[in-house]
């Protein structure tokens, strides 16, 4: 008797919607690369199902997933970057679903870090700066960055701004006197590599300072 | 082609430290894989000690962690094990392979070494 | 750590014949599973390895199967220079662990 499923278990399988998605990260931990795959259907009784990645590989031909909860992940140098390769959910040697997908055009960037912003008295405006660890990347560099910023009271209403560089200039003007604000960013591969959106930065909070009277210009903070 | 090939003394005494080396050829111990450390005592049971990875980072056996280094000398494309305090139980045929981490397989490993500890 | 049990420690068999060997994980180790033959005086070699498997340039007589913690290894029609050790290993969490290994013996 072999581990895997059994006949009437894989005719149950079957039945089942064994949808996934995947991301890759690239150079995400020295020059190692990961690619995360979940099912889409969050009750899929995942207890004997494996991903496996074959093809585009460096010096092997197929290479098997870790698992850890629902999330199946691989961390590895071996990925060539260049073509297609074949994804598949498998029950002991029985692929249930498979995918080819090139892991260049499913790219998740890392989070962008060290949001913050500086008000310029003399200028009357303030100066958002962030970092991304993709500047020192040799594959994914070039990415389109999203600052969203809100007025802490207002839930739903962010305004968001696309750039390529990690710095961006707000104008005073333009924000509410004397109101809490909150700042995130994300980015997204923006040249060769296609992608999905990072996760968002943590989010950073400011005050915009009153207005002075005499002025009718804004006190510093 | 991949070849390992292991280096030590042969005999140590008691509570002394076993130092060998795994000399590679034919891949970059730098490029990529896991480069292990495995023994097998003289019942034949394989007792798998540890790795450095290509990047330099290492992992050990908890039941070794205290007493086991394992380094390398990427200039002589050449990994070492170090282990202190031995005792007769760690006689045993000691192995350098490559594999394991993102592979499930040792796939080349070296000839062997005995090693005999006693005084 | 993962304890790994094969069986049995030993067997006898014909040429010819065919042989399986078992290994069970204490925990689920999903597809991390490789099989090793070792001759005496020489270094283990693969065989099988993600559990199904086989190594460059094995003889198809040598297969595997099972995954999450039942795995098995067969030898179709055994040659003279199968008689020899067989191990199991898994890869799924450090410290990576063996079986206790399968002398094979000529009937």
């Known amino acids: 008797e072999s581990g895997y499923a059994q006949n009437g278990d894989l005719e149950d399988a079957e039945l089942d919607d064994y949808s996934f998605s995947c991301y890759s990260q690239l150079e995400v931990n020295g020059s190692q690369h990961s690619l995360t795959c979940a099912f889409e259907d969050p009750d899929v009784n995942i207890t004997n199902l494996e991903f496996e990645i074959c093809g585009a590989l460096v010096e092997v031909k197929c290479l098997n997933f870790r698992k850890l909860q629902e999330i199946y992940f691989i961390e590895t140098k071996k990925f060539l970057l260049i073509g297609k390769s074949n994804i598949c959910v498998k029950v002991g040697e029985k692929s249930l679903t498979c995918k080819k997908i090139d892991l260049t055009t499913i790219v998740k960037p890392e989070a962008p870090f060290d949001l913050s912003v500086v008000y310029r008295e003399g200028a009357n405006d303030f100066v958002v700066t962030f970092n991304t660890s993709h500047l020192q990347k040799k594959y994914v560099k070039v990415l389109m960055h999203d600052v969203a910023y809100r007025q802490e009271k207002d839930e739903n209403k962010w305004t968001h701004v696309n750039l390529s560089s990690t710095k961006l200039t707000l104008l005073q003007r333009k924000l509410q006197p004397a109101a809490m604000y909150e700042i995130k960013v994300r980015s997204i591969p923006d040249h060769y590599f296609k992608g999905f959106w990072s996760e968002w930065s943590p989010s950073y909070y400011f005050r915009t300072p009153e207005i002075n009277n005499s002025s009718g210009e804004m006190d510093p903070i | 082609d991949v070849q390992l090939q292991e280096s030590g003394p042969g005999l140590v005494k008691p509570s002394q430290s076993l130092s060998l080396t795994c000399t590679v050829t034919?891949?970059?111990?730098?490029?990529?894989?896991?480069w292990n450390w495995i023994r097998q005592f003289p019942g034949n049971k394989l007792e798998w000690m540890g790795y450095?990875?290509?990047?330099?980072?290492?992992t050990y056996t908890p039941s070794l962690k205290s007493r086991i280094s394992i380094t390398r000398d990427t200039s002589k494309n050449q990994f070492f094990l170090q282990l202190n305090s031995v005792t007769t139980e760690d006689t045993a045929t000691y192995y350098c392979?490559?594999?394991?981490?993102?592979?499930?397989?040792?796939?080349?490993w070296g000839q062997g070494t005995t090693l005999t500890v006693s005084s | 750590d993962i304890q790994m049990t094969q069986s049995p420690a030993s067997q006898s068999a014909s040429l010819g014949e065919s042989v399986t060997i078992t290994c069970l994980a204490s925990q689920t180790i999903g597809a991390w599973l490789a099989w090793y033959q070792q001759k005496p005086g020489k270094s283990p070699q693969l065989l099988i390895y993600?559990?199904?498997r086989l190594a460059d340039g094995v003889p198809s007589r040598f297969s595997g199967s099972g995954s999450g913690t039942k795995f098995s290894f067969k030898i179709s029609s055994l040659q003279a220079e199968d008689f020899v050790s067989y191990y199991c290993q898994q890869f799924f969490s450090t410290p990576w662990t063996f079986g206790g290994g399968t002398k094979l013996e000529i009937k």
């Open positions: 993600a559990a199904t």
């Open positions: 034919g891949y970059s111990i730098t490029t990529d894989y896991a």
């Open positions: 392979a490559r594999g394991g981490y993102d592979v499930n397989y040792f796939d080349y």
């Open positions: 450095i990875f290509y990047s330099g980072s290492t």
